[in-house]
Structures are given as C-alpha cells and as structure tokens.
Amino acid sequence: RRRRRDTHFPICIFCCGCCHRSKCGMCCKT
C-alpha cells in the first residue's frame, strides 16, 4: 500500500500503447 504522502504523485510504469503513444516505453499517470 502506498504511503498517504505518495498518493498525489504520478506512478510510472513500463507499458505499451500508453500515454497517448503507439510504442512501448515509460508512462507516468496520477
């Protein structure tokens, strides 16, 4: 479980077709 102070930060993961992109790479989302 994330610490409360972390919850408003984006979490970054590797994924494909994420973050409005067609390829694979890092994507950070709140």
């Epitope: 994330r2 610490r3 972390d6 494909c16």
Partner: antibody, heavy 121, light 107 residues
Framework: QVQLVESGGGVVQPGRSLRLSCAAS????????MHWVRQAPGKGLEWVAV????????YYADSVKGRFTISRDNSKNTLYLQMNSLRAEDTAVYYC??????????????WGQGTMVTVSS | SYELTQPPSVSVSPGQTATITCSGD??????ACWYQQRPGQSPVLVIY???KRPSGIPERFSGSNSGNTATLTISGTQAMDEADYFC??????????FGGGTKLTVL
Amino acid sequence: QVQLVESGGGVVQPGRSLRLSCAASGFTFSSYGMHWVRQAPGKGLEWVAVIWYAESNKYYADSVKGRFTISRDNSKNTLYLQMNSLRAEDTAVYYCARAQEGIAPDAFDIWGQGTMVTVSS
Amino acid sequence: SYELTQPPSVSVSPGQTATITCSGDKLGERYACWYQQRPGQSPVLVIYQDIKRPSGIPERFSGSNSGNTATLTISGTQAMDEADYFCQAWYSSTNVLFGGGTKLTVL
C-alpha cells in the same frame, strides 16, 4: 543553470558499503524522476536504478537488486545511492541522470559529471 | 535476456554522412534514444523517442527506428562529432538497456 553534481565515490574493500549523493540545482527536483547509471572503465553504460516522483516508485537492475538502495530528499534537492555488499564488478564511474520531463520520460536528458567507485582489496 | 548490439566502430570523412545502427529484438516496438559521449565527458542526449532532437542539438543529427534496428544518422559530419555513441531503450520497468557503444572516428 541545470546541474547535477555527484559525490561520495572512492576506494572501498569488497563487502563494504558506500553512499553516493547527487546534488541537483537549476530545476524543480521533485518534479523529475532520477536515475543512477554506471560505466566501468573502458566499457559501456549500464543502468542501475530509478526513483520516480513517489518514494515508493523505484526500480533496480537485477545486478544490484537487494544490495543497492536509491532514495531522494526533495527538501535538499539530493539523490542518493546506498551501495552495500560491494563487489569488484561494481567498480565504475557512477552518474546520476535526470529523467525527461512529461508523462512519457524514456530518456535521460541531464547527466552529472560522475563519481568514481573502486572496489578493491 | 534482451541486448542491444552496436558496431564497435564507424569511420567517416568530414562532411560525409555517418550511420550508426543499434539492433535488438523488437526494438522498433520501443522508443529508442541516443547519447553522445566525448572522451572524458558525461553522456549527452542527442535523440529521443526515435526521431526527436533536444533543444541545442544540431539538425545534422537524426534518427529512425523500425523492425529490429534503430539508426542514428549524422549528416555533414564534423570533427567535433567524434565521440562514442550509445543507443538506449526500455524493455521493462526494471530493464533499461544501453547498446555497447560505437566509436565514431572522423578521418
């Protein structure tokens, strides 16, 4: 100007520990992911670890997982790498590098000058 | 395990075009970046997201990436371009790969 300055390198015996620091200036440190990348003498680049915006969101290369810990202190604009159980193969120049801004930070857009770590008995 | 493969060295005459390749399994499905490292200096980002140039990088640097190969092209190569060049791509959240590096010599 945007700058990253590493410190804490030196000569250390196998099995011992060392902590590297990277002081950031010229940008909003808390708004960027930060990496450690190393380069053995005469060799190529090897990614070591990344810490994203949240302290809990960090990843390590298999070669250092369980031995190295990346952390950051946003109030001090400083990135750290705690290196335990050091091995001869950890000998390298260690660079801190800033992750690109934005929602898709694939690249390392700013690099420090590096600090040399030598593991030798 | 994945790896990115680059030719150890490439030679080019001043004013000519230098082409440096980076090969890896399904590399074209990932975004590739390129870094320049002059002797004794830190790496500098020259291409990101396959084809984009950071501000301050000359237009003579360009990139492409499809299939299993990413390519860095330097048009009108200058003596100051002599350096090591490294490709880089993400293969997972815990696997950021760099190529072994290519030494560009401007004859």
